[in-house]
């Protein structure tokens, strides 16, 4: 599934509306390992990879395409 990297750059959003903090309004139990799709405003967050949202930490995470590394998959992996 590529390299998964995480970044603390977030405003606590889970569902895509600036005024919402969806994690505070859902009844689900927050267990590590639960990923959700990143809200729409993160559409271009991952440069060379797929964005997914870490529900337990409310942070965007990038699953990098092969050959790319970095918090936002912005760097070429020279060892690839």
């Amino acid at each position: 599934d590529g390299n998964s990297t995480r970044s603390p750059e977030t405003n606590g959003l889970l569902c895509g509306d600036p005024e919402e903090n969806c994690a505070a309004t859902t009844t689900q139990s927050k267990r590590k390992g639960h990923f959700s799709r990143c809200p729409k405003q993160y559409k271009h967050y991952c440069i060379k990879g797929r964005c997914r949202f870490v529900v337990a930490e409310q942070t965007p995470s990038c699953v990098c395409d092969e050959g790319y590394i970095g918090a936002r998959c912005e760097r070429v992996d020279l060892f690839y």
């Epitope: 569902c15 895509g16 689900q28 139990s29 390992g33 990923f35 799709r37 729409k40």
Partner: antibody, heavy 120, light 106 residues
């Protein structure tokens, strides 16, 4: 071929229980979140429940919360919906659907549906 | 909770363009997906992520989403496009469907 096949529907009395199954084939079941969606006769689509890829988190519509339980067995490539305290308004065709990826995307594969009729 | 509102019915002549709307508060900030359902059949995804088309779906199907309205457009509508169409989005961690639109090809 990617396929979802529901089973377990039928006629049940109000207050009764039923367990639906959805057998998945043709893809890596454990990579995908799964969902149940229902459609009452002549009505539109209504989301029922969702479960993440490993079964650790589940989500329900208010209309079924506390009565229905979604689960999955990744070793059997099967999704389940345990329905208790059934009501007449639960009468519908129940579809299982695959999430494109881990959770929160779109429903790219649907089963053919299984009819649940709640009536005395 | 977000509500998605669709017109109950839309009529179009063969070869003409059909537009089906899906309205909801600030829906442009969410991804919207569209499903086609023919009588007695399961729904089929025809547009995802506002405007992307799955493989196997004809090019005449397109979508847009901005502000409070998402739109499914069928250009050069054919008789086989007659069906019910549903929009869908996520609200918090729940799935929301529009009420559906019956497209009639006259």
């Amino acid at each position: 071929e990617v396929q979802l096949l529901e089973s377990g529907g039928g006629l049940v009395q109000p207050g009764g229980s039923l367990r639906l199954s959805c057998a998945a084939s043709g893809f890596t079941f454990s990579d995908h979140a799964m969902h149940w969606v229902r459609q009452a006769p002549g009505k539109g689509l209504e989301w029922v429940s969702s479960i993440v890829y490993d079964g650790s988190n589940t989500f329900y519509a208010d209309s079924v919360k506390g009565r229905f339980t979604i689960s999955r067995d990744n070793s059997k490539n099967t999704l389940y919906l345990q329905m208790n305290s059934l009501r007449a308004e639960d009468t519908a065709v129940y579809y299982c659907a695959r999430d494109y990826l881990d959770f929160g995307y779109y429903f790219d594969v649907w089963g053919q549906g299984t009819l649940v009729t709640v009536s005395s | 909770d977000i509500e998605l509102t669709q017109p109950p019915s839309v009529s179009v002549s063969p070869g003409q363009t059909a537009s089906i709307t899906c309205s909801g508060d600030k829906i442009g900030k969410k991804y919207v997906h569209w499903y086609q359902q023919k009588p007695g059949q399961a729904p089929v995804l025809v547009i995802y992520d506002d405007s992307d088309r799955p493989s196997g779906i004809p090019e005449r199907f397109s979508g847009s989403n901005s502000g409070n309205t998402a739109t499914l457009t069928i250009s050069g509508t054919q008789a086989e496009d007659e069906a019910d169409y549903y929009c869908q989005a996520w609200d918090m961690q729940s799935v929301v469907f529009g009420g559906g639109t019956k497209l009639t090809v006259l």
